[in-house]
Interface confidence: low
């Protein structure tokens, strides 16, 4: 059974503003920001299925249920692409498809869904409790990622259990929704500040963060956005990931991939690109990328192939045909 990930109920933001402005005054802007950020959010679904004929082979199907146009799809395993996951395939609607072992066949299914067959042999073969993730970069929604895996007790031919909720990665320039909401939030907060100008100016405190997190960004809308991005996330099992990235990502492929930076081709991630903050819900995971770094005045690290991936405008290879129909 394939389950399409639903955006979960959002937890309230952690206290980030302390000082003269009272708690009640801050509730409304947080609520407004939270509601606006999540209004009309798209969905990503992931289906992982073991082939009955080859018990060590998997088929991963992913789809995007947003209204925007997809600019890139990245499939990874071992967790989200920017959080320890290893890229298996990258699909571009015009430039074509690039895949790395053990990916056998990555294909477009429709304009908004893809599938990937994984070959199960050798050190880089998947196993039943591997987590597979699909990230859809879309304009104007931004990047959305969802993950799924087979339960260890799955019979061959069965599909994955319900997919974990999608991980929002607001990392595309011009994400109109979030930008607009944040702008509105800023204006509203300024309005509140003006109303309270006779009081002492608020001290902006960094939110409580885990030791692994990048330094907290003392900016209220950023924290509000992080609050809106809190989503449950399944524990990542990495025991079945390939021993080395070189074996998983052999070089070669169409000419338009030739100029792909080595680090991006091997592992498009940057450790500082994913913020991990404590969340009341058990096993929660939050990821925030370029959009919020930009707000904090930081330039995010290059975390994926999206920026420099397609230097050849001609795209010498047409996109491969899809596998299956949704």
């Amino acid at each position: 059974m394939r389950t399409e990930a639903q955006v979960p109920a959002l937890q309230p933001p952690e206290p980030g503003l302390e000082g003269a402005m009272g708690h009640r005054t801050l509730v409304l802007p947080w609520v407004l920001l939270t509601l606006c950020v999540t209004a009309g959010t798209p969905e990503v679904w992931v289906q992982v299925r073991m082939e009955a004929t080859e018990l060590s082979s998997f088929t991963i199907r992913c789809g995007f249920l947003g209204s925007g146009s997809i600019s890139l799809v990245t499939v990874s395993w071992g967790g989200p692409n920017g959080a320890g996951g290893t890229t298996l395939a990258v699909l571009h609607p015009e430039r074509g498809i690039r895949q790395w072992a053990p990916a056998r066949q990555a294909r477009w299914e429709t304009q908004s869904s893809i599938s990937l067959i994984l070959e199960g042999s050798g050190a880089s073969s998947p196993c039943a409790n591997t987590t597979f993730c699909c990230k859809f970069a879309s304009f104007p929604e931004g990047s959305w990622e969802a993950c799924g895996s087979l339960p260890p007790s799955s019979d061959p031919g069965l599909s994955a259990p319900p997919t974990p909720a999608p991980i929002l990665r607001a990392d595309l320039a011009g994400i109109l929704g979030v930008s607009g909401v944040l702008l509105f939030g800023c204006v509203y907060l300024l309005h509140l500040l003006r109303r309270h100008k006779h009081r002492p100016a608020p001290r902006l405190q960094p939110s409580r963060t885990s030791p692994q997190a990048p330094r907290a960004r003392a900016w209220a809308p950023s924290q509000a956005s992080q609050a809106a991005l809190h989503v449950p996330y399944a524990t990542i099992n990495t025991s079945c990931r390939p021993a080395t990235l070189d074996t998983a990502h052999p070089h070669g492929g169409p000419s338009w991939w030739a100029s792909l930076p080595t680090h991006a081709a091997h592992r498009p991630q940057g450790p500082a690109a994913w913020a991990s903050t404590p969340i009341p819900a058990r096993g929660s995971f939050v990821s925030v990328e370029n959009g919020l770094y930009a707000q904090a005045g930081e330039r995010p690290p290059h975390t994926g192939p999206g920026l420099t991936l397609f230097p050849d405008p001609r795209g010498p290879r047409a996109m491969e045909g899809p596998l299956g129909v949704r």
């Epitope: 059974m1 088929t59 047409a318 491969e320 045909g321 299956g324 129909v325």
Partner: antibody, heavy 119, light 107 residues
Framework: DVQLQESGPGLVKPSQSLSLTCTVT?????????WNWIRQFPGNRLEWMGY???????NYNPSLKSRISITRDTSKNQFFLQLNSVTTEDTATYYC????????????WGQGTLVTVSA | DILLTQSPATLSVTPGETVSLSCRAS??????LHWYQQKSHRSPRLLIK???DSISGIPSRFTGSGSGTDYTLSINSVKPEDEGIYYC?????????FGGGTELEIK
């Protein structure tokens, strides 16, 4: 083995509604896939009408959007086609189908049911 | 909508011949093009998926090729039981669309 069987009146009067049922055996319609209605006109032209997904989401052919509704009864493992304001142009053989490819590339279709729109 | 144009509309061949049926899409369907055979008073049967992928249970004399907007179904050494109408179908984007069909007649 998955089987689909269409049923419904073979004759419908113009301006009335056409209602067909597809009964599925061998697989739960809430488990997966998209459950489609396709029709074939007397001249053999085939037209995809729309589908209802396992989760209840629907997708219709824009040419029929104002007249078509696809629903389901999960307890009976059936899904339904309703086409409103029919004309003689809607006379066709109506198929229900899973346009889904499993690992052998198999596609399941019903046997089809002929519906004639006539006064 | 993506328009699929099949040619020829009808084809009459003798057993043993090799025939090619064409399907042209109004825009790129990225090989999400599927071929069906329909015999009289029967439901369509899938012959080829994704332009060139063979289907288990379908004779190997049926082969598909093509990419972009132009696709071909070839039948090597036609047999009498191959008589019927052949349709191409694109499932790349909704609304899904079928070609008008090529009727294959065996002399």
């Amino acid at each position: 083995d998955v089987q689909l069987q269409e049923s419904g009146p073979g004759l419908v009067k113009p301006s009335q509604s056409l209602s067909l049922t597809c009964t599925v055996t061998g697989y739960s319609i809430t488990s997966d896939y998209a459950w489609n209605w396709i029709r074939q006109f007397p001249g053999n032209r085939l037209e995809w009408m729309g589908y209802i997904r396992y989760n209840g989401n629907t997708n219709y052919n824009p040419s029929l959007k104002s007249r078509i509704s696809i629903t389901r009864d999960t307890s009976k493992n059936q899904f339904f086609l309703q086409l409103n304001s029919v004309t003689t142009e809607d006379t066709a053989t109506y198929y229900c189908a899973i346009i889904y490819y499993d690992y052998d590339g198999f596609v399941y279709w019903g046997q089809g049911t002929l519906v004639t729109v006539s006064a | 909508d993506i328009l699929l144009t099949q040619s020829p509309a009808t084809l009459s061949v003798t057993p043993g011949e090799t025939v090619s049926l064409s399907c042209r899409a109004s825009q790129n369907v990225y090989e999400n093009l599927h071929w069906y055979q329909q015999k009289s008073h029967r439901s369509p049967r899938l012959l080829i998926k994704f332009a060139s992928d063979s289907i288990s249970g379908i004779p190997s004399r049926f082969t598909g090729s093509g990419s972009g907007t132009d696709y071909t179904l070839s039948i090597n050494s036609v047999k009498p039981e191959d008589e019927g109408i052949y349709y191409c179908l694109q499932l790349y984007s909704t609304p899904y669309t079928f070609g008008g069909g090529t009727e294959l007649e065996i002399k």
